[in-house]
């Protein structure tokens, strides 16, 4: 089974403001999985609709 994402490196602990960093294997770049109530590429915005 090929994983679609890896853990981000330690250097990226602050990459996501309110979320978890995942390194996308195919795109070869980091991305953020936002905590509940946050949105944005870096989970930097509070979700006003939540």
């Amino acid at each position: 089974v090929v994983s679609h994402f890896n853990d981000c490196p330690d250097s990226h602990t602050q990459f996501c403001f309110h979320g978890t960093c995942r390194f996308l294997v195919q795109e070869d770049k980091p991305a953020c999985v936002c905590h509940s109530g946050y949105v944005g590429a870096r989970c930097e915005h509070a979700d006003l609709l939540a």
């Epitope: 490196p9 250097s11 294997v25």
Partner: antibody, heavy 115, light 106 residues
Framework: VQLQQSGAELVRPGASVKLSCTAS????????MHWVKQRPEQGLEWIGR????????KYAPKFQDKATITADTSSNTAYLQFSSLTSEDTAVYYC?????????WGQGTTLTVSS | IQMTQSSSSLSVSLGDRVTITCKAS??????LAWYQQKPGNAPRLLIS???NLKTGVPSRFSGSASGKDYTLSITSLQTEDVATYYC?????????FGGGTKLEIK
């Protein structure tokens, strides 16, 4: 997909200089951009990085007061600026972005500090 | 994180299988790159993620990982492979590089 760096610089001691690194084929906002130094006949040394999406920077301690890294997302370009240059700053400087499957390095900019 | 390349130089013969080793002082979870550099040239990225061969790099180059130990192998050394090789960790900041291993022909 590449990183294109500015041309060689010859500057006087005490002066300042700003080197550039323009990305094509990817968006610099996607990940951190880094700068690396290599003095003549020496190894490689990490200077620091920038998160182009928000301007946040991190530097190796020895470069904290020497280097300033900035980025302009509209031109997809990262910059490395030096102040109060000395002969110790004579080196080749590389910009780079690294992933797990791929990595990108500029061709390097030679900086010579000489009176 | 310290990266140690135990050999600063290796005396090799053309056609040899060459192994260059790099040891990390901490776990870096395969966030390791290998570079080839020839005098007057920029470092050339060979491998990222410990094992991923960059497009265009000959298949005689390969990378492997075992715990904190990383290896670059060249199956049959060619004249154009004579260079200095560096490892680099990019798991944590600051990024750190090994001191380099220079291949010299016997």
């Amino acid at each position: 997909v590449q990183l294109q760096q500015s041309g060689a610089e010859l500057v006087r001691p005490g002066a300042s200089v700003k080197l550039s690194c323009t990305a094509s084929g990817f968006n610099i906002k996607d990940d951190y951009m880094h700068w690396v130094k290599q003095r003549p006949e020496q190894g490689l040394e990490w200077i620091g990085r920038i998160d182009p999406a928000n301007g946040h920077t991190k530097y190796a301690p020895k470069f904290q007061d020497k280097a300033t890294i900035t980025a302009d997302t509209s031109s997809n370009t990262a910059y490395l600026q030096f102040s109060s240059l000395t002969s110790e700053d004579t080196a080749v400087y590389y910009c780079t972005r690294m992933g797990l499957r791929r990595g990108y390095w500029g061709q390097g900019t030679t900086l010579t500090v000489s009176s | 994180i310290q990266m140690t390349q135990s050999s600063s130089s290796l005396s090799v013969s053309l056609g040899d299988r060459v192994t260059i080793t790099c040891k990390a002082s901490e776990h870096i979870n395969s966030w390791l790159a290998w570079y080839q550099q020839k005098p007057g040239n920029a470092p050339r990225l060979l491998i990222s993620g410990a094992t991923n061969l960059k497009t265009g790099v000959p298949s005689r180059f390969s990378g492997s990982a075992s715990g904190k130990d990383y290896t670059l192998s060249i199956t049959s050394l060619q004249t154009e492979d004579v260079a200095t090789y560096y490892c680099q960790q990019y798991w944590g900041t600051p990024w750190t590089f090994g001191g380099g291993t220079k291949l010299e022909i016997k």
